[in-house]
Interface confidence: low
């Protein structure tokens, strides 16, 4: 029987870049307010965007149910097209892979088709990014 004590467990270094953020509210013509529920994430949120430090492919999962119909896009760099875009939906449950690089920032843009500018409430709003190329170029 083999016992590992805490000091003997080999560290996984560097840890895989990943983050899970939640969002409960989106602002029309703007984005969704994202928060990271865990302090232990290896990626960070800054100015309502997820900061990319490592080049490579990322698994991206996006889920949520919206209080009204909206169009939602997920961007990674100003002046570039969206990672993906959904038009006139009340829910999203999508998964995909995209190549991202150091200095990219992942953020939302949301527009609704109603005349009111009230916030859109979100239930079960979750965005997950998981880096698929550990050992690749990273800058911190």
């Amino acid at each position: 029987c083999l016992h590992f004590y805490a000091s003997q467990v080999p560290p996984q270094y560097p840890p895989i870049q990943s983050i899970r953020v939640q969002f409960t509210r989106c602002e029309n013509e703007k984005g969704c307010i994202i928060t990271s529920p865990s302090k232990d994430e290896t990626m960070k949120v800054q100015d309502n965007s997820i900061i990319i430090n490592c080049d490579g492919f990322y698994l991206i999962s996006l889920k949520g149910y919206f209080s009204e119909e909206l169009s939602l896009s997920l961007y990674y760099r100003k002046g570039r097209g969206p990672l993906f875009s959904l038009s006139k939906v009340t829910s999203v449950d999508s998964i995909g892979v995209a190549y991202l690089a150091f200095k990219d920032k992942v953020y939302f843009n949301v527009t609704t088709h109603s005349t009111s500018y009230k916030d859109i409430q979100v239930n079960g709003g979750e965005l997950i990014l998981i880096h698929q190329n550990p050992g690749g170029f990273c800058a911190y």
Partner: antibody, heavy 116, light 112 residues
């Protein structure tokens, strides 16, 4: 299509136990808080119990607390209601329902009859 | 607990007329998150309840635009315009602002 299918309802003696199950399909079950709501014959709707989307938080109405336990298995897309020490006044159709903002998805209900 | 009082208990309306149902809460349903968790449900004879309106005025997907909700704080109204025979059933309001989730006693709508 969204579907919630309840089962487990039966005729039981006062003091007896039953376990209701509700299997969900057609939506992301693990994103939804799940509720059990009951309706006594010819009466209105009464909330019974709630379990949060992750299963960490459970709530129940005063009249069933300590007797009924709500649980869920997100891997099986199933929510349960374990009912112990059943009383005649627990006789009702029990509905399982998923809450997004309102209780948007409902099952067909399962009848629990408590009688001696 | 928040008590939900609904009026009238029953209502008889001719086809193509408008029906109004009122719901009053014993305390404000405005949640600290800024939402008002007031829902309207219809239970047709022999069927499970179905959600019509959530967050006071938002129609659930697939619900006819003949159904509309309004109100704030403690007073809310469901309006059904151009009533049809298929609207027959019992209408309930429910609040999810504070546990326990509570329902009204219902309004039975009959089409003449």
């Amino acid at each position: 299509a969204v579907q919630l299918v309840e089962s487990g309802g039966d005729l039981v003696r006062p003091g007896g136990s039953l376990r209701l199950s509700c299997v969900a399909s057609g939506f992301t079950f693990s994103n939804f808080d799940m509720y059990w709501v009951r309706q006594a014959p010819g009466r209105g709707l009464q909330w019974v119990a709630t379990i949060s989307y992750d299963g960490f938080n459970t709530y129940s109405t005063d009249t069933v607390r300590g007797r009924f336990t709500i649980s869920r298995d997100n891997a099986r897309n199933t929510v349960y209601l374990q009912m112990n020490s059943l009383r005649v006044e627990d006789t009702a159709v029990f509905y399982c329902t998923a809450r997004r903002f309102g209780l948007g998805y409902w099952g067909q209900g399962t009848l629990v009859t408590v009688s001696s | 607990d928040i008590f939900m009082a609904q009026t009238p208990p029953s209502l008889s309306v001719s086809p193509r007329e408008t029906a109004s149902i009122s719901c009053k809460a014993s305390q404000s349903l405005l949640h600290s998150d800024g939402n008002t968790y007031l829902d309207w449900y219809l239970q047709k004879p022999g069927q499970s309840p179905q959600l019509l309106i959530y967050l006071v005025s938002n129609r659930f997907p697939g619900v006819s635009d003949r159904f509309s909700g309004s109100g704030s704080g403690t007073g809310f109204t469901l309006r059904i315009s151009r009533v049809e025979a298929s609207d027959t059933g019992v209408y309930y309001c429910g609040q999810g602002t504070q546990l326990p989730y509570t329902f009204s006693q219902g309004t039975k709508l009959e089409i003449k």
